[in-house]
Interface confidence: low
């Protein structure tokens, strides 16, 4: 990779080492500009493999208010608009970074965490395990 | 819900309005530790609405690499393993938050960011506008 | 630009009223799911309510639900909150915010107005 020079503006911080404590601002850059904030609004309701939309909310996280997928059927829905098991529904899942509040409570200090979070589902060929 | 008291030992904070500058350890905490590591490594191959994943690397971000799905078709797989047109697949994009180095190059401070990243894909009905 | 100004903020007595407006612009506020969220003195920030694009569905925290409404007219563009039955413990600067789902955060703030309640 390439090496690049350190901005001699930057803030002083007496530890260097990894792990460490950061300064972050918490002011969001989006860079999100160009997107259709309707961009997939309503695929939950139009996918084969539909799923609904679970708050999870906790005052300890940053952002504290996450939306998790939950898929609705075990089997993905047919051209005739029923559940066909055949195939299976399963969530699309993702590790985002998000802030917990360390130690509890406190609102200028935290500490990076990663979760696992369910963003929608989508329609597979299930696994069928053959019996000799 | 609870009011939560202020934790005596946090520590200080200059600046106690939003926006504001926070402490942030690096330090990521996992709290994914029961989840199996392959729950959805195959899912883009099993798919009706199969994807490819590829990397985006940024030095200059924190995570430095975010792995981006891209739909194979435009059109779902069906029960004979041809593509179907009269399905799309469509990419399920969330948002996330990442850190940016602000200034850049310095190793200390950060800017919260969040950017859009499309997960995996989902097979959906097509919106069809009749002409009048 | 997005543009988000809070009004309505003021000092009530407990058990009192006020009504807090989020003028908007800059963005097509039809679009976007609205919050307010709160932080009160020397403490970390609290998610209030929200409301769907079309103000059909609202969510509140435990601690205001019955006394607190979020409401929207998409056709001027504005956020609203109202908040009776006060107490103390409502004291805090309250912000409108403009967010996102799968999953929500907020990307916009505005300046905050703040609401003291005390006698």
């Known amino acids: 990779g390439i090496t690049i020079p350190r901005n001699p503006g930057c803030p002083n911080s007496e530890d260097k080492n990894f792990p460490r404590t950061v300064m972050v601002n918490l002011n969001i850059h989006n860079r999100n500009t160009n997107t259709n904030p309707k961009r997939s609004s309503d695929y939950y309701n139009r996918s084969t493999s539909p799923w609904n939309l679970h708050r999870n909310e906790d005052p300890e996280r940053y952002p504290s208010v996450i939306w998790e997928a939950k898929c609705r059927h075990l089997g993905c829905i047919n051209a005739d608009g029923n559940v066909d098991y055949h195939m299976n529904s399963v969530p699309i899942q993702q590790e985002i970074l998000v802030l917990r509040r360390e130690p509890p409570h406190c609102p200028n200090s935290f500490r990076l965490e990663k979760i696992l979070v369910s963003v929608g589902c989508t329609c597979v060929t299930p696994i069928v395990h053959h019996v000799a | 819900g609870i009011t939560i008291p202020r934790n005596p030992g946090c520590p200080n904070s200059e600046d106690k309005n939003f926006p504001r500058t926070v402490m942030v350890n690096l330090n990521i905490h996992n709290r994914n530790t029961n989840t199996n590591p392959k729950r959805s490594s195959d899912y883009y191959n099993r798919s009706t609405s199969p994807w490819n994943l590829h990397r985006n690397e940024d030095p200059e971000r924190y995570p430095s690499v975010i792995w981006e799905a891209k739909c194979r078709h435009l059109g779902c797989i069906n029960a004979d393993g041809n593509v179907d047109y009269h399905m799309n697949s469509v990419p399920i994009q969330q948002e996330i938050l990442v850190l940016r180095r602000e200034p850049p190059h310095c190793p200390n401070s950060f800017r919260l960011e969040k950017i859009l990243v499309s997960v995996g894909c989902t097979c959906v009905t097509p919106i069809v506008h009749h002409v009048a | 630009e997005v543009q988000l100004v809070e009004s309505g903020g003021g000092l009530v007595q407990p058990g009192g009223s006020l009504r807090l407006s989020c003028a908007t612009s800059?963005?097509?506020?039809?679009?976007?799911?609205m919050y307010w969220v709160r932080q009160a003195p020397g403490k970390g920030l609290e998610w209030v309510a929200e409301i769907k694009q079309d103000g059909s569905e609202k969510y509140y925290v435990d601690s205001v639900k019955g006394r607190f409404t979020i409401s929207r007219d998409n056709a001027k563009n504005s956020l609203y909150l109202q908040m009776n039955s006060l107490r103390a413990e409502d004291t805090a600067v309250y912000y409108c915010?403009?967010?996102?789902?799968?999953?929500?955060?907020?990307?916009?703030w505005g300046q905050g107005t703040l609401v003291t309640v005390s006698s």
């Open positions: 915010a403009k967010g996102e789902i799968l999953p929500l955060y907020f990307d916009y």
């Open positions: 800059g963005f097509t506020f039809s679009s976007y799911g």
